[in-house]
Interface confidence: low
């Protein structure tokens, strides 16, 4: 799997999970989240050569097409596969609220 | 929806469905498929600016992050959303076989 266990231990130009820490205030301009101040969102990036973690038959076809037609922009893309939620604390007036924001953390990637 | 009805009628640099005909023999080197000779596979391409058909909360976060940090390579990518199968005819010896290849045709796109 193109997850932290593999990607963070290997230098990989191909599609893989990349570390990314996001500071809510600095990076997103969000001032409403009280805790945490930021989180390890991660992201997916890298090339999708033929058969590299292809998600569907179409992405396999597309990567093979791209091999034969190298400068066509019709190639698969490295995107998130498994995502996890993030629990946040924010305030409505003086009332604290705890909420789970779904699909905030990328855990693994795929070529789609 | 970023499908043919919208994308093929509009000049759109942002993430959208693009027409792509694939000839099995010429474009993929596949000689085993007897019929069809090729098919309209389509593909997804284009920019993913903030809130442009974002698939998940993470992709929305990432596009906002990319707006504030434009030189970062952490940005969402335009990929397939809905896919359809393709029915093919091939031969095993002289015996014709009809099979449905799943996820071969892209019908719509998303930023993920």
């Amino acid at each position: 799997a193109l997850d932290a266990a593999y990607c963070f231990r290997n230098v990989q130009d191909n599609c893989c999970l990349r570390p990314l820490y996001i500071d809510f205030k600095r990076d997103l301009g969000w001032k409403w989240i009280h805790e945490p101040k930021g989180y390890n969102a991660n992201f997916c990036a890298g090339a999708c050569p033929y058969l590299w973690s292809s998600d569907t038959q179409h992405s396999r076809v597309l990567s093979l097409y791209n091999t034969i037609n190298p400068e066509a922009s019709a190639s698969p893309c490295c995107v998130s596969q498994d995502l996890e939620p993030l629990t946040i604390l924010y305030y409505i007036g003086k009332t604290p609220k705890i909420e789970q924001l779904s699909n905030m953390i990328v855990k693994s990637c795929k070529c789609s | 929806a970023l499908d043919a009805a919208y994308c093929f009628r509009n000049v759109q640099d942002n993430c959208c469905l693009r027409p792509l005909y694939i000839d099995f023999k010429r474009d993929l080197g596949w000689k085993w498929i007897h019929e069809p000779k090729g098919y309209n596979a389509n593909f997804c391409a284009g920019a993913c600016p903030y809130l442009w058909s974002s698939d998940t909360q993470h992709s929305r976060v990432l596009s906002l992050y990319n707006t504030i940090n434009p030189e970062a390579s952490a940005s969402p990518c335009c990929v397939s959303q809905d896919l359809e199968p393709l029915t093919i005819l091939y031969y095993i010896g002289k015996t014709p076989k009809i099979e449905q290849l799943s996820n071969m045709i892209v019908k719509s796109c998303k930023c993920s």
């Epitope: 034969i68 190298p70 400068e71 922009s73 | 792509l20 005909y21 391409a45």
Partner: antibody, heavy 125, light 112 residues
Amino acid sequence: EVQLQESGPGLVKPSETLSLTCTVTGFSLSSYTVNWIRQPAGKGLEWIGYISYGGSAYYASWANGRVTISKDTSKNQVSLKLSSVTAADTAVYYCARHMQVGGAPTGSMAAFDPWGQGTLVTVSS
Amino acid sequence: EIVLTQSPGTLSLSPGERATLSCQSSQSVYNNNYLSWFQQKPGQAPRLLIYGASTLTSGIPDRFSGSGSGTDFTLTISRLEPEDFAVYYCAGGYSGSSDKYAFGGGTKVEIK
């Protein structure tokens, strides 16, 4: 009807930058790759570079470092800039689209069709 | 540097005769068939005749034909018509090279 039309100054001074525009009609630059090709008087064709419909630019090795190809999709325009020109850059400059085969962007099939009518650029002081 | 060599430089023939033009590439064109032929008349832009080494462009008379693979290619005009007297160029497409395309030096077909 699909058409390409080159425009720009016909005379450029040595050491200056040559700037040309290719205006296209009948198709979208977000769907097709456009090439620049030149032809010195009485000589053969010379590929300069292209900008793909995805926005990537590629240049001939002889032109690298001197040439920039860009596009403005909303204006249907592709531009060519060639810096530090000399008399050797005097030529007819053409823009040409990659043709489309069965809906597929054929890319390196070298299938350039259609072409603009060309514009003559003379480098002289 | 990729070099496409066309021969002969000039071909002197009479209407009704058969013309055979050669194009040799210093390295294999991509997919062995990424080669085109163009016709150019004085004061006009080149016109695409053949692409993919042997596929005739729509609207081009079938007296024109292309053959060859890899590094050696031939354009044949089975029976020369008065309007066929012109200069012919071959162009090759390449992968893994900074020069994606190269043109041959041209063959002039003139009236004998």
